[in-house]
Interface confidence: medium
Amino acid sequence: AGVFELQIHSFGPGPGPGAPRSPCSARLPCRLFFRVCLKPGLSEEAAESPCALGAALSARGPVYTEQPGAPAPDLPLPDGLLQVPFRDAWPGTFSFIIETWREELGDQIGGPAWSLLARVAGRRRLAAGGPWARDIQRAGAWELRFSYRARCEPPAVGTACTRLCRPRSAPSRCGPGLRPCAPLEDECEAPLVCRAGCSPEHGFCEQPGECRCLEGWTGPLCTVPVSTSSCLSPRGPSSATTGCLVPGPGPCDGNPCANGGSCSETPRSFECTCPRGFYGLRCEVSGVTCADGPCFNGGLCVGGADPDSAYICHCPPGFQGSNCEKRVDRCSLQPCRNGGLCLDLGHALRCRCRAGFAGPRCEHDLDDCAGRACANGGTCVEGGGAHRCSCALGFGGRDCRERADPCAARPCAHGGRCYAHFSGLVCACAPGYMGARCEF
């Protein structure tokens, strides 16, 4: 048994243009409240019971009224932690959903107005008894900063809160800093201390002196983002000695995608294609109405106001998937012609054209010989995106500027002797042979 604790640090407009000034309009005073929902990491719970580990609701925050023209202050937040008690073992890997709600006051006829401003979801690895983990999540134009931890309630101890540790009548039997544990009176437990330097944000330990990394981090102290690792193998657990990923099972082994999602390997990890109504890294988040904000990357949610009608996400350019969760690989359509290199810049598509071609899609074949001169009577031949000179006899090279030795290639067969001549070459054939190259 234990308690998951969530501390909201701030909620407000995220960085970048188009961010709202404040969740409260100047018309009506409002206040915020938060809801957290927890599920075991590999949960396949449907929406009927989406918070298998528990859920909690914050108190209402202080009332805030936006002052027109005044700089937007930090929004007042509800006091205290959101606490989700759990009865059984802490699962270690868990999914969370944090919702930010606005309650507008002032128009008391029929009660206040509520709005679900933001909904963030994620899957994390967390050992009970560890330090606070900090996180930043963005939902649309909003940014939520928070910390969380899981702690055991006495007498439970350990990273899963499954061991019992009861104070004994004679605690002095254990050395300094140690505490006696059940079931053996002479068994003493040391406080869990991770390897020195182990990142408090990205690492944790289940045994003293170790440093195990959260998803996305590697290195002996969990300080290296996986995406910047210089290792060759794209899969496997983190090696404590090199910080590199060592070969292991495939990321799709055992299908990590919940709720009927299908798994496909990517160069560094895996990708779940979720059925409608589910989303998240592993399709672990169930959401079936537009109120849940299931459309990512600025997708517009239509329909699905009631539970029996599916929502549809209308995705902005560059995104696809039932939840607009996948960036379209626009280069896979091979839009660049004539061998041009495709570059997807996110906001636009660019084609880098081969020499001799131009245009947005390299569709224009340039005159390769325009402005190109071949020396010494050579003629320009167009083709293949580059000019080529057909040189007069006795000359060679790209532009026919080099004097060529026609005898260099030993053109005279059967022992014939080659003589260079202003008009080309002459073969003096050995007895018994004839022809321009002594070939007969």
Epitope: G110, S115, L116, P307
Partner: nanobody
Framework: EVQLAESGGGSVQAGGSLRLSCAAS????????MGWFRQAPAKEREGVAT????????YYADSVKGRFTISQDNEKNTVYLQMNSLKPEDTAMYYC??????????????????????WGQGTQVTVSS
């Protein structure tokens, strides 16, 4: 077809208690919110209480705070309204409803009928003095 069926209404003396039930059927997923409304003769329908599908958000009309408790059982797809210390002015037809915000940032009124898409047929509660 989504269907909501209320039960548990009846006649009771002032100060008594009743427990209303609302069984939902016809859809796989829970609605975002389930609410109880009531309508007395010649009066407008008014919100009494609402609860979200995860059982964490509840809201009550001022007139019933401290006396009524809304709860839900997800396994049974049922929402309950426990009514204690009943008063004659609580006499009305009580309706169960399902609904919720349509989109993010949509203003949604938990105790107003337009915020709900589905309605039951109602169950009568009569409190005599």
């Amino acid at each position: 077809e989504v269907q909501l069926a209320e039960s548990g209404g009846g006649s009771v003396q002032a100060g008594g208690s009743l427990r209303l039930s609302c069984a939902a059927s016809g859809y796989t997923y829970r609605s975002n919110f389930m609410g109880w409304f009531r309508q007395a003769p010649a009066k407008e329908r008014e919100g009494v209480a609402t609860i979200d599908s995860r059982g964490t958000i509840t809201y009550y009309a001022d007139s019933v705070k401290g006396r009524f408790t809304i709860s839900q059982d997800n396994e049974k797809n049922t929402v309950y309204l426990q009514m204690n210390s009943l008063k004659p002015e609580d006499t009305a037809m009580y309706y169960c409803a399902a609904g919720g915000p349509r989109t993010n940032d949509d203003r949604w009124y938990p105790l107003r009928p337009p915020g709900y898409n589905y309605w039951g047929q109602g169950t009568q509660v009569t409190v005599s003095s």
